[in-house]
Structure formats: C-alpha cells, structure tokens
C-alpha cells in the first residue's frame, strides 16, 4: 500500500518521464544557480513537501537529489540562513521501509546522517548545517534542480 | 518598509567606468535577486544584470563584457561597474529589489528613485 | 531573446473609463512570468502585476491582468486621474529580462 505521499511522488514523476524530450541544457537558466553539472533553484516561499514536488515538476525540475556527501556539503554552502529549511527529493517509503529518492532509488546509509526518526509522511530537509527527518506536512522552503548536459566534442568520421 | 537608494557620480567621462552603489534600508539583503535596470532619457527600460548571495550574478549578454555587480551584505549594499562607456550609456540608473521566479515577491516588486548618470567629457 | 510588442502605443480617454492594454510576446512565456509596471514621469516605475494575473502589495482591484502563452493583457476597469501613466509589460523568465516599449494613456 503506497501512502498518499509516495503517489504524488510516482505520479509526477510518471508525467515528467511522458514530457518529450527536451535539447540538453548547456547553461543554467536565469535566476537558477550553477553547482558544478546542476543548475539549482532555492525558493522563497514555504510548502509542504508534494507542493514542493509539484512546484518543482511545473518549473521541468525535480525536488533536489544529492549523490553524495560532498555534494550535500557544497549545497549546504550556498544556504545563507542558519535557520532555515529546504526540502530535497527524499521521503520514507512505507511500503519499503527505507528512504527513498524520488527518482526510485533508494538512500545509501552512509550518504547522509539523519537527524529525526524514519517513519510514515516523513521527508528530507537540508538546512546550512544537518539533514533532518521531518513531517512532510510541514511548510518549509525547497530546492528544485535541473541537469546540466555535459558538453562532449564531437567525432566525426573521416569522409 | 524596504528602501533602495542609489549612489554614485552623476558625470562620466567616455571609456571610463560608471561606478554606483545602491544601499538597502529597512529589510535583509540576503536571499534576494538585486538587480540594475537603466532607462536613456525619453526611452525605454532595460535590464542590465543582477546579484544574490554574493557570488551569483547574471547580465544581459549584450552588455556581459562590461558589467560587475557585487554585493556587499555586511554594508547592505550592491553596486554596478559599467566599464568602457560612451553616450549611449547616458540613463536613469535604477536599482530593484528582484523576486526572481521563486518567492512571495516576484519580478521587480521595489525600486530606487533612480539616479541620472551622464557621460560626456 | 523575448521581444514584447505593446499596443498601442498612447491610449487617449477620460476618467472613469475602461483601459485595455495588450502585450504580446515573440515566444512563450511559460510559466506566465509575465509582469506589468506603472510609470510617471521623474518617478521609478511601480509593480502592480506579477504573474500575469496577480496583483502586487498595495496595487487597486480595478488592475487585473490576464493572458498566457504569448498573448497578455492589463485592464484598468475605471480609471482614476492618478492612472494616467505609461505602462510597462515585462518577462521575467528567459535571459534576458525584457521590457515592452510601453503603451502611454493620456487624458482624453
């Protein structure tokens, strides 16, 4: 049984996969910073965390997935605010009973230390310090991101 | 009640560098788009570039070449380089408070009165 | 680069009557960043929409914008001596910002 929470995230995920395909972006667009091949968005406003999801879907972006430790690190240093929350793209799948990113992947324990418990309508905040577990109900700001497309020469065959 | 209110010399001679700054009063410099836009005389507005968190900028491509602008949280201000100019640079200089695309304010939702920067020699 | 055509150019009325102002833009502007401003001379132009539809901090409910895609409009329902101005759309969504050329409305 998938909560209210992973059906949201399935569902524009599943309509963002139907999107045709769109030319590799070369550059982050205006207002969107550039954190090595990510163009990342910090919002302004607060929402829950599927309204942060949706918003993210309507600007052709996903809720922010982090790969690594030192990813996080470096996205935690363009947070300016010590106290203030963003959501990324991770929320606890009950059906699973792990930490799932929302691109279906599941979380790698020693990715990010966790502060909060793991449990039903619990999502993933960031904050300029620590990573915690919080009720996806909550109305705090998000990160949206887009993919840069790596720029690879071209080989052509000799004619 | 945020207020912007720009700085800096109203005559410029040609091929020297235009240099204003706009203090921020009355709110948090950080987490906004701080943008220049510039008006010549009887003409209409064009957007020239903007700075957030310090180390993120963004211009117009038309002037890219000649433009810095910086911030300075600490002071609560932002300022504009303009290098190289000649008349065409002649404008009301306005500094603006940018919303961006992501927050409860969005485009330029506060101004300053606008300076006049003239450049003749 | 989004070029925005306005029109028209100067609108002549009287107080109390209703304004339409069109801009219309040389691509999509998704997502509707589309914004109008108020200008008065010696001043520094005010928002009034943001949005394309929704109404600034302070702005009169006798503003109301609407349009999407390419095609947008600003309505001044009745207008008050202090709207007599011009009127600048704006996109906000593609590098770079651009500004139509403004429509003027002068007093009739």
């Known amino acids: 049984q998938k909560s209210s929470i992973e059906k949201c995230s399935v569902d524009i995920q599943q309509s963002r996969n139907k999107t045709t395909e769109r030319p590799g972006l070369l550059n982050c667009p205006i207002y969107w910073q550039q954190l090595r091949e990510k163009c990342l968005l910090f919002s302004h406003t607060v929402n829950p965390w599927n309204n942060s999801l949706a918003d993210c879907s309507t600007k052709e972006s996903s809720l922010l997935l982090i790969r690594d430790k030192d990813e996080l690190i470096h996205t935690q240093n363009l947070i300016r605010d010590k106290a203030i929350l963003f959501w990324i793209g991770l929320n606890f799948s009950l059906s699973e009973k792990n930490w799932k990113w929302i691109n279906g992947s599941f979380l790698n324990s020693n990715d990010l230390e966790i502060r909060g418990d793991a449990k039903e309508n619990s999502c993933i905040s960031i904050s300029q310090t620590s990573v915690y577990s919080e009720y996806c109900s909550t109305e705090i700001r998000w990160i949206c991101q887009k993919e840069l497309t790596p720029v690879r020469n071209k080989v052509y065959p000799d004619s | 009640q945020v207020h912007l209110q720009e700085s800096g010399p109203g005559l410029v001679k040609p091929s020297e560098t235009l240099s204003l700054t706009c203090t921020v009063s009355?709110?948090?410099?950080?987490?906004?788009?701080w943008s220049w836009i510039r008006q010549p005389p009887g003409k209409g507005l064009e957007w020239i570039g903007y700075?957030?968190?310090?180390?993120?900028?963004y211009y117009n491509p038309s002037l890219k070449s000649r433009v810095t602008i910086s911030e300075d949280t600490s002071k609560s201000q932002f300022s504009l380089k303009l290098s190289s100019v000649t008349a065409a640079d002649t404008a009301v200089y306005y500094c603006?408070?940018?919303?961006?695309?992501?927050?409860?304010?969005?485009?330029?939702?506060?101004w300053g009165q606008g300076t006049m920067v003239t450049v003749s020699s | 680069e989004i070029v925005l055509t306005q029109s028209p150019g100067t609108l002549s009325l009287s107080p109390g009557e209703r304004a339409t102002l069109s801009c219309r833009a040389s691509?999509?502007?998704?997502?509707?960043?589309l914004a109008w401003y108020q200008q008065k001379p010696g001043q520094a132009p005010r928002l009034l929409i943001y949005?394309?539809?929704s109404r600034a901090t302070g702005i009169p409910d006798r503003f109301s914008g609407n349009g999407s895609g390419t095609d947008f409009t600003l309505t001044i329902s009745r207008l008050e001596p202090e709207d007599f101005a011009v009127y600048y759309c704006?996109?906000?969504?593609?590098?770079?910002?651009?500004f139509g050329p403004g429509t003027k409305v002068d007093i009739k």
């Open positions: 603006a408070r940018d919303g961006g695309i992501v927050g409860l304010t969005a485009a330029f939702d506060i």
């Open positions: 009355g709110g948090s410099i950080i987490s906004y788009y």
């Open positions: 700075v957030y968190n310090s180390e993120s900028t």
């Open positions: 691509q999509s502007v998704s997502s509707n960043y």
């Open positions: 949005g394309a539809s």
């Open positions: 704006q996109q906000y969504v593609n590098s770079p910002i651009t």
